[in-house]
């Protein structure tokens, strides 16, 4: 039985031409973790695989950095990062996990960051 | 340049164990995991499992875990695949070979090793 | 583990013609797709990475594409030196997986 919850930044905006942290926190479950896939709908930014270290995916390479810890840190955002991200926790013995984070680029200064929430 | 050198063929007998190794030169070795590859019948290939030199961390394919063992040697460069109580479906050509510079695919692979398993 | 399907074992093929394989994973892998080339008594070498990534050095008539389940990989105008078999792999979640192969002769 999965017991486990995702926590996320929740909603977040930032403005264009800086950077943000994309961070998931796993709780509630004793499942190890294997494995944290990062995607924007049906594009493929990252994997931190617990054993074999980080994978950047090239289209991204310039532009995001792993880390902290599990999460994704998105350099130099542009209007078209706007956008849902998923955070996919691969877990032995419960299975996956989704955690959902909204991100939205702002062209002005105002951008400020959303409560965190709770997926279960 | 980025050099992957495997141990010579080895013929073993039913039930013995196989050590191959794989010696690297031409990069820092500990920045790099290292897989193993199995190849069956000259086509199919299967992923046994990839070490993290710099932590010793390793990731397995549940069907080679408790047959297969992974290490390093970091003195000498050179990643070792240990497999045991070997059976016929065991013959094949073994792999090792590296991933990317934050990429999983492999980019550089070894020349192979030919296990045979024969009484 | 995630199944890397290729339905053709062997392709024949002309000189210049376009040839086009498949692989088809039985759950989504996102781009997390290679393809290798392997030549006869060689070992596998790295042509595409990321689905649609040419790795350094590789010809451009060589090209992959796909997301998710379904990825193509294209030869544009085959070469006589292209006789090889073609592995596609997914590296998306652990156990890495292959593909079949895909055994590709000159007519």
């Known amino acids: 039985m999965m017991t486990g919850t995702i926590e996320t930044t929740g909603n977040i905006s930032a403005e264009k031409g800086g950077s943000i942290i994309l961070q998931c926190h796993l709780s509630s479950t004793t499942a190890q973790v294997t494995q944290v896939n990062w995607e924007q709908q049906d594009q493929l930014l990252a994997i931190c695989n617990a054993d074999l270290g980080w994978h950047i995916s090239p289209s991204f390479k310039d532009r995001v950095a792993p880390g902290p810890g599990l999460g994704l840190t998105l350099q130099s955002l542009t209007v078209n990062d706007t956008g849902e991200y998923f955070c996919i926790y691969h877990t032995y013995p419960d299975g996956t996990y989704t955690g959902r984070i909204f991100l939205e680029v702002l062209e002005s200064s105002v951008a400020e960051h959303g409560a965190r929430f709770q997926i279960p | 340049e980025v050099q992957l050198q495997q141990s010579g063929p080895e013929l073993v007998k039913p039930g013995a164990s196989v050590k191959i190794s794989c010696k690297t030169s031409g990069y820092t070795f500990t920045e790099y995991t290292m897989h193993w590859v199995k190849q069956s019948h000259g086509k199919n290939l299967e992923w046994i499992g990839g070490i993290n030199p710099n932590n010793g961390g390793t990731s397995y394919n549940q069907k080679f875990k408790g047959r297969a063992t992974l290490t390093v040697d970091k003195s000498s460069s050179t990643a070792y695949m240990e497999l045991r109580s070997l059976t016929s479906d065991d013959s094949a050509v073994y792999y090792c070979?590296?991933?990317?510079?934050?990429?999983?695919?492999?980019?550089?692979w070894g020349q192979g090793t030919s296990v045979t398993v024969s009484s | 583990d995630i199944v890397m399907t290729q339905s053709h074992k062997f392709m024949s093929t002309s000189v210049g013609d376009r040839v086009n394989i498949t692989c088809k994973a039985s759950?989504?892998?996102?781009?997390?797709v290679a393809w290798y080339q392997q030549k006869p008594g060689q070992s596998p070498k790295l042509l595409i990475y990321s689905a649609s990534y040419r790795y350094t050095g590789v010809p451009d008539r060589f090209t992959g594409s796909g997301s998710g389940t379904d990825f193509t990989f294209t030869i544009s105008s085959v070469q006589a030196e292209d006789l090889a078999v073609y592995h596609c792999?997914?590296?998306?979640?652990?156990?890495?997986?292959f593909g079949g192969g895909t055994k590709l002769e000159i007519k």
């Open positions: 070979a590296r991933p990317g510079w934050y990429n999983y695919a492999m980019d550089y």
């Open positions: 792999q997914q590296h998306y979640i652990t156990p890495w997986t």
């Open positions: 759950q989504g892998v996102s781009t997390a």
